[in-house]
Amino acid sequence: GITIPRNPGCPNSEDKNFPRTVMVNLNIHNRNTNTNPKRSSDYYNRSTSPWNLHRNEDPERYPSVIWEAQCRHLGCINADGNVDYHMNSVPIQQEILVLRREPPHCPNSFRLEKILVSVGCTCVTPIVHHVQ
Amino acid sequence: GITIPRNPGCPNSEDKNFPRTVMVNLNIHNRNTNTNPKRSSDYYNRSTSPWNLHRNEDPERYPSVIWEAQCRHLGCINADGNVDYHMNSVPIQQEILVLRREPPHCPNSFRLEKILVSVGCTCVTPIVHHVQ
């Protein structure tokens, strides 16, 4: 394993006041998967609701790099390649678990966190609100 | 904190052979306070590439229930509400982290695992392969 020198300001798991703390093996099962979504498929370009992928990097988080989708248009691309504003491009969101260093910069101490990420976009029929 | 008696069959974090292991505070912090992903949408029904959500359940994993999207059609829904097979409904996949007890039933020892889930579907222009 990797040994990292203990920072005296970082929490000690033996400390009774430290919240419910466990050991987590970071030797991830299923490493073979490809984390860059651009490499896995070109759906982001071929979709009728295309999106750009933005790199969200945070060294205090694990995983440190998360790719966030941003829909390119408010509308969707029609058969002629033009944007049709009668339809809407919307992000599909997913809640994911990440680990955040807590306190910051402590190599061996993390907190479990849930964050919301946009994975891609889909084209939907808009909800029309009828005025009474 | 909660103190749990150590099971002699569970790994010792001091063990030099134990893989890269960190302390994690499992009191989950939820950053999504204003954006509840569950509330977020009925896009699965309104999309031109609609999908059904299937339950993937594993009691030895956290989260125990993960919803998998399955596209309803091979094609996409056109303006008339019919399936257009000149376009393709495809799943958007996301790699997520889950926690698994390892060894099983050891209260203070977990392993991170990456799994690939389908979050929703999008409508794409098919790739046409021209025969030489």
């Epitope: 919240p19 | 989950i28 956290y62």
Partner: antibody, heavy 117, light 106 residues
Framework: QVQLVQSGAEVKKPGSSVKVSCKAS????????ISWVRQAPGQGLEWMGS????????NYAQKFQGRVTITADESTSTAYMELSSLRSEDTAVYYC??????????WGQGTLVTVSS | DIQMTQSPSSVSASVGDRVTITCRAS??????LNWYQQKPGKAPKLLIY???SLQSGVPSRFSGSGSGTDFTLTISSLQPEDFATYYC????????FGQGTKVEIK
Amino acid sequence: QVQLVQSGAEVKKPGSSVKVSCKASGGTFSSYAISWVRQAPGQGLEWMGSIIPWFGTTNYAQKFQGRVTITADESTSTAYMELSSLRSEDTAVYYCARDSEYYFDHWGQGTLVTVSS
Amino acid sequence: DIQMTQSPSSVSASVGDRVTITCRASQGISNWLNWYQQKPGKAPKLLIYAASSLQSGVPSRFSGSGSGTDFTLTISSLQPEDFATYYCQQYSDDPTFGQGTKVEIK
């Protein structure tokens, strides 16, 4: 098959506290949450809060915040719900339920708590 | 909190009847809606989760539909053991239940 077995009926005085237990038999808690739901006589169901025993993470309904404490002891696969400052309107059947964070699929048999002077 | 409103509050029906119960959410909850059956003196039992998925072991005469704010539980052919109170519950946010619909013998 997961079974949730709750402690017996309680009669309490106003202002006191009650602690109800819920033991998971036929398996560990696994990674699910345990929620507590109550039902006053002849009334509907009201969610009080939950705990993920694996983690010790709790979530309470705003109405009960500060008055309810949910804990879990993994070594005995038992969850507890303690309600303090009891008043007559807390008279209800209290249920524990296995909670996937999407639905409640297994329920305890219920514990009747009567608050009376 | 998200309010859940069920209608009707009670319904009288005979064995073999088709029974429909509706549930309306005060705001959009996507498909995060469940239906439970409760008999007197017993704990609730999960029938339908995620608006339309039948929980294992539940007879196929029970079905659920809807999305957003309006949902329906249908019992296609009422059986003697179906006389009970039915509750809808949202889990889009902290869980809340409808006030219940009692299905009684006509």
